[in-house]
């Protein structure tokens, strides 16, 4: 029949070339003389002249090695024609499959491979998986069938069975316990990948294995004991670096150091911090220690890490022993801001208050006051007895150096230590207001019509405070009362000028006499400037020959 | 009838070259791989290449490698034999040979010979 | 490279007698071998492929067989064109190694 099996080919064949193959042959061939033909990849397509086939006699033949990792089956069609060329049999598939011969050795997918694994892990734990490929064929023959192995591993500490491979996966995992970084760190193992599914050409690779820290070791205090002096009252002073030593990898949560002050600190005096490159802790004051109050303090420091320990292990402890230094305080006014009520005005010498301060230092030491700042000048200190005293005239009304009718100065204490240091108080004296000022109108220059005059409303203002202000009573005076009338309005903060005879165009002086609710009466000269015209002016129109 | 016949033969200096031609008739020329055999003044026979029927694909035993090439020109009929660098043991009487039935060497020419000396 | 051992190099034997030539592969070569013969006149003619089958227009007197490495060419009945040289060609390893030849010689 005209039909062919599929032929199999080994790759690799060592010839002699042209090698036939098989014999097409149609059974036409008794009655016409065939001629044969074959086309396809391989045959008259690339990789074109693998195959070719003898005309006459129908023999198929090799003309090269087959490589069946370059392509593992030919597709070739058989043709038969007669002599003048028609066709005589359907063309026929001709498969030739090239069988694998094992000629490629497993390749690792990576010179080197690496994986890491937490020291401490329990046997059974993969650590990564390592590849090899081999281009020969897996499914019909073991050529291609990769087999893992652990050639060596070094170091060999604690022994040399610390890992193990799958055989068909390359999944490495831990076989032994007892790994720890802080004595192997990092594993070199040298695999091997081996064809024939263990029994054929071997290649090998890298498996470099990185041991991961866990806490497994504790911080300990080096030394254990310290003792520190630190002067009263500073505030965040360097009081003593503490040092620790931890075998967990450095600059790692399990290395890096965490303190706490577990005793000795009941005021909350002080605070301990980590530094981040040294790993010290650095003791500090959070708050002024008083020598006066308590000379000594013992500290108890216990140290742990930033990740929490992965076994039990007994924690580090530090003894710090401060002892607090002395030194020369400055005395303290108290209260530090002192409020004083004071008549404004009141005469020269008259005590205005007594303002002294402490000295915390123990021993008795001599303080001596004066004034630091005082602004207007109006008061003096007696050295010895902080008796403030007034030197000039307090004026509540004195815009310059009272504000909201407080006055402020600074004082001075001054102790006989030495060197001697000094304390600052302040003192707050709040004028109480004298009815001192009378009213005053605002403007004063006004121009009005002499013709259907306009009533000027003029407003009152008096620097006192109430009740020395309104309402306000207004009267005029030296005859201005008889072309001009003043009323003060119903609220009594304005005083109403009214014009009540016809004055020529000119310019002149009305004489206003205020008086507040304290009948302080202030006497005011207004400047009134009366133009012919009508109604409501603000300067006279047409040429103005007035002085 | 399968015919082949040689020619090109001649006398050449040691390190000269030589072309040899075969003319084949009376066979689908292009569908046969083709080979030299060469026979020594000992008689004794020497396979010196083949060509496959396409000409894509060419064999030489170490001998001759490097120093002789065969071609092939299937619109011609004809098979060539380059001949270069060529010592006194290449004199011989050359024949082209084609496989039949898949095999060596089905039909013979009837030589061309080849003299090297100086 | 496969040796071929052909033998005997000449050999003398009447008209109506049969002979036979043998070959020996010096490697396994399978049945890919051929005896050709040599006319005085230098023309080479292949008689048997594949160890044991005739090309055609092959007298019938001409038989090829195996025993092992061993290859023989019989000639059963000698006729006067066949005292001519005779060669053996393997063709299953490369190179292609041919024997030296038999010179059959009437006697």
């Known amino acids: 029949d005209w039909v062919v099996a599929p032929i199999s080919v080994p790759e690799n064949g060592k010839g002699p070339f042209p090698q036939r193959l098989n014999q097409l042959k149609s059974n036409k061939d008794r009655d016409t003389k065939i001629f044969y033909s074959i086309t396809g990849p391989g045959a008259d397509s690339p990789p074109e002249g693998v195959f070719a086939v003898e005309k006459e006699t129908g023999w198929l033949l090799l003309n090269k090695p087959l490589d069946r990792e370059e392509i593992a089956k030919y597709e070739l069609y058989g043709h038969a024609v007669s002599e003048n060329g028609a066709s005589v049999e359907e063309p026929m598939n001709i498969s030739i499959i090239v069988t694998d011969q094992n000629d490629n050795k497993p390749k690792f997918t990576q010179d080197t491979f690496r994986g890491s694994v937490l020291e401490g892990v329990l046997p059974g734990t993969s650590v990564m998986q390592v590849t090899a490929t081999d281009e020969d064929d897996a499914i019909y023959t073991y050529n291609g069938v990769v087999a893992y192995s652990i050639h060596s591993q070094e170091p060999k500490d604690p022994h040399d069975l610390m890992f193990t491979i799958h055989r068909s996966t390359g999944t490495i995992s831990v076989i032994s316990s007892g790994l720890d970084r802080e004595k192997v760190p990092e594993y070199t193992l040298t695999i091997q990948a081996t064809d024939m599914d263990g029994d054929g050409s071997t290649t090998t690779a890298v498996a470099v294995v990185e041991i991961l820290d866990a806490n497994d070791n504790a911080p300990m205090f080096d030394p254990q004991k310290y003792e520190a002096h630190v002067p009263e009252n500073a505030v965040g002073h360097e009081v003593q670096r503490l040092t620790v030593t931890d075998l967990d990898a450095p600059n790692s949560p399990a290395w890096r150091a965490t303190y706490l002050i577990m005793g000795g600190d009941d005021g909350d005096h002080f605070t301990i911090t980590t530094h981040p490159e040294s790993n010290q802790g650095i003791l500090t004051t959070r708050k002024g220690l008083d020598f006066e109050a308590k000379n000594q303090h013992t500290l108890y420091v216990e140290v742990t890490n930033e990740a929490p320990f992965v076994l039990k292990l007994p924690t580090s402890t530090a003894t710090i022993v401060v002892h607090v230094e002395d030194v020369n305080e400055a005395p303290v006014f108290v209260p530090p801001s002192k409020v004083v009520e004071v008549q404004e005005g009141i005469p020269t010498g008259e005590p205005v208050c007594v303002y002294t301060a402490e000295d915390p230092d123990k021993e008795n030491q001599k303080i001596s006051y004066r004034i630091l700042r005082d602004p207007a000048g109006w008061l003096a200190m007696d050295p010895d007895s902080g008796q403030v005293t007034a030197v000039g005239t307090l004026d509540r009304e004195d815009e310059q150096f009272v504000r909201n009718n407080i006055y402020e100065v600074m004082v001075l204490a001054m102790d006989n230590g030495s060197p001697p240091t000094t304390g600052t108080g302040t003192l707050l004296l709040t004028l109480i207001d004298v009815n001192d000022h009378g009213p005053v109108p605002e403007p004063r220059q006004i121009t009005i019509c002499n013709q259907s005059p306009v009533r000027q409303v003029l407003n009152i203002t008096d620097k006192d405070l109430s009740p020395h202000t309104s309402p306000f009573q207004a009267q005029l005076t030296d005859d201005s009362d008889i072309y001009w009338t003043a009323e003060v309005n119903e609220e009594g903060d304005t005083v109403v000028l009214s014009l009540k005879k016809f004055l020529k165009q000119d310019t002149y002086d009305v004489h206003l006499s205020l008086s507040d609710h304290g009948n302080k009466e202030q006497l005011t000269v207004i400047r009134a400037t009366v133009c012919d015209c009508h109604g409501h002016v603000e300067t006279c129109p047409g040429p103005w020959k007035g002085g | 009838v399968q015919l082949v016949e040689e020619s090109g033969g001649g006398l050449v200096k040691p390190g000269g070259s030589l072309k040899l031609s075969c003319a084949a008739s009376g066979f689908t020329f292009s569908s046969y791989a083709m080979s030299w055999v060469r026979q020594t003044p000992d008689k004794r026979l020497e396979w010196v290449a083949t060509i496959s029927s396409g000409g894509h694909y060419t064999y030489y035993p170490d001998s001759v490698k490097g120093r002789f090439t065969i071609s092939r020109d299937n619109a011609k009929n004809t098979l060539y034999l380059q001949m270069s660098s060529l010592k006194s043991e290449d004199t011989a009487m050359y024949y082209c040979?084609?496989?039949?039935?898949?095999?060596?060497?089905?039909?013979w020419g009837q030589g061309t010979t080849v003299t090297v000396s100086s | 490279e496969l040796v071929m051992t052909q033998s005997p190099s000449s050999l003398s034997a009447s008209l109506g007698e049969g002979v036979s030539l043998t070959c020996r592969a010096s490697?396994?070569?399978?049945?890919?071998l051929i005896w050709l013969r040599q006319e005085p006149d230098g023309t080479i003619k292949r008689l048997i492929y594949?160890?044991?089958s005739l090309d055609s227009g092959v007298p019938k007197r001409f038989s090829g067989s195996r025993s092992g490495s061993d290859y023989s060419l019989t000639i059963s009945s000698l006729e006067s064109e066949d005292f001519v040289h005779y060669y053996c060609l393997q063709y299953g390893s490369s190179p292609l190694t041919f024997g030296a030849g038999t010179k059959l010689e009437i006697k």
């Open positions: 594949d160890t044991s």
């Open positions: 040979a084609s496989y039949y039935y898949g095999i060596p060497f089905g039909y």
């Open positions: 490697q396994d070569i399978g049945i890919n």
